[in-house]
């Protein structure tokens, strides 16, 4: 039975050209975490494997840093990068776990971050 | 188009050192890591290792640690691998290959080279 | 180590015949599989990733199905230039493992 839950950063918002920081925790499971995907509505951005390291899709290297921990820094951003991103955790023995993060990418400096909540 | 070619066969003693080489051409070299896979004669396949040109960090299959060591020039977008201490059953053909898009399975492959180690 | 089995070992078939090769992980790796293809003498070929995606090239009478510990290639028609030996592998953990290998051979 999977009990956890994957709290997430929410609803954000940076300006353009600027950095974010994607980040999802897994909770209330013993589960062990064997893979975390990040990905940009169905595009993969990166995998962090607990057992290879980080794969960064290559069309993406210049503009995505691993990490923090589990999570994904994007950089120089641009306002086509406005959408939902997905953290997808793999684990044992639960199975796989999603998040969900809405991010938008302003023109302007009224970027602020928005409430975590939580996805069941 | 996207190629991979890989330095001659090698012919060396017991307790000797080589090091392959492998070409890239026709894609951004730092963006994609590139593997190491041997296939001695008549048997199946088994990776050695990979590298990450754009920061040059190794993963090595526990194996093969302390055998081979990665490195690359991305100067000239190549990538070597050194194997020591080499015995007879290192007698195998070596493969570069062309990391995938989506993760840690291999795109394209060079040709290969084989290293015979015989006293 | 994940060890991947591969059967058959070894097939005879005939020019368009439809042809199924498995491959058994020992434990669940997903979709995490990828399908390569080799001729005598010659490096291996990518046919399959992710367990069912083709690279650009590849004839799309090849295709691949399956997630967690049971995956199969499938050559819909055998075409005289698929007769080689067929490799799966993970990509899911450290050791990246390859099957034993299935030979198609010429019935």
């Known amino acids: 039975m999977m009990t956890g839950t994957i709290e997430t950063t929410g609803n954000i918002s940076a300006e353009k050209g600027g950095s974010i920081i994607l980040q999802c925790h897994l909770s209330s499971t013993t589960a062990q975490v064997t893979q975390v995907n990040w990905e940009q509505q169905d595009q993969l951005l990166a995998i962090c494997n607990a057992d290879l390291g980080w794969h960064i899709s290559p069309s993406f290297k210049d503009r995505v840093a691993p990490g923090p921990g589990l999570g994904l820094t994007l950089q120089s951003l641009t306002v086509n990068d406005t959408g939902e991103y997905f953290c997808i955790y793999h684990t044992y023995p639960d199975g796989t776990y999603t998040g969900r993060i809405f991010l938008e990418v302003l023109e302007s400096s009224v970027a602020e971050h928005g409430a975590r909540f939580q996805i069941p | 188009q996207v190629q991979l070619v890989q330095s001659g066969a090698e012919v060396k003693k017991p307790g000797a050192s080589v090091k392959v080489s492998c070409k890239a051409s026709g894609y951004a070299f730092s963006r994609y890591s590139m593997y190491w896979v041997r296939q001695a004669p008549g048997q199946g396949l088994e990776w050695i290792a990979f590298?990450?040109?754009?920061?040059?960090?190794?993963t090595y299959n526990q194996r093969f640690r302390g055998k081979a060591t990665l490195t690359v020039d991305t100067s000239i977008s190549t990538a070597y691998m050194e194997l020591s201490r080499l015995r007879s059953d290192d007698t195998a053909v070596y493969y570069c290959a062309r990391g995938g898009d989506y993760g840690w399975y291999l795109g394209v492959w060079g040709q290969g080279t084989l290293v015979t180690v015989s006293s | 180590d994940i060890q991947m089995t591969q059967s058959p070992s070894s097939l005879s078939a005939s020019v368009g015949d439809r042809v199924t090769i498995t491959c058994r992980p020992s434990?669940?790796?997903?979709?995490?599989l990828s399908w390569y293809q080799q001729k005598p003498g010659k490096a291996p070929k990518l046919l399959i990733y992710?367990?069912?995606s083709l690279p650009s090239g590849v004839p799309s009478r090849f295709s691949g199905s399956g997630s967690g510990t049971d995956f199969t290639l499938t050559i819909s028609s055998l075409q005289p230039e698929d007769f080689a030996t067929y490799y799966c592998?993970?990509?899911?953990?450290?050791?990246?493992?390859f099957g034993q290998g299935t030979k198609v051979e010429i019935k």
């Open positions: 434990e669940n790796i997903y979709t995490y």
């Open positions: 592998q993970h990509h899911y953990g450290n050791p990246l493992t």
């Open positions: 992710n367990a069912k």
């Open positions: 590298i990450d040109p754009y920061n040059g960090g190794s």
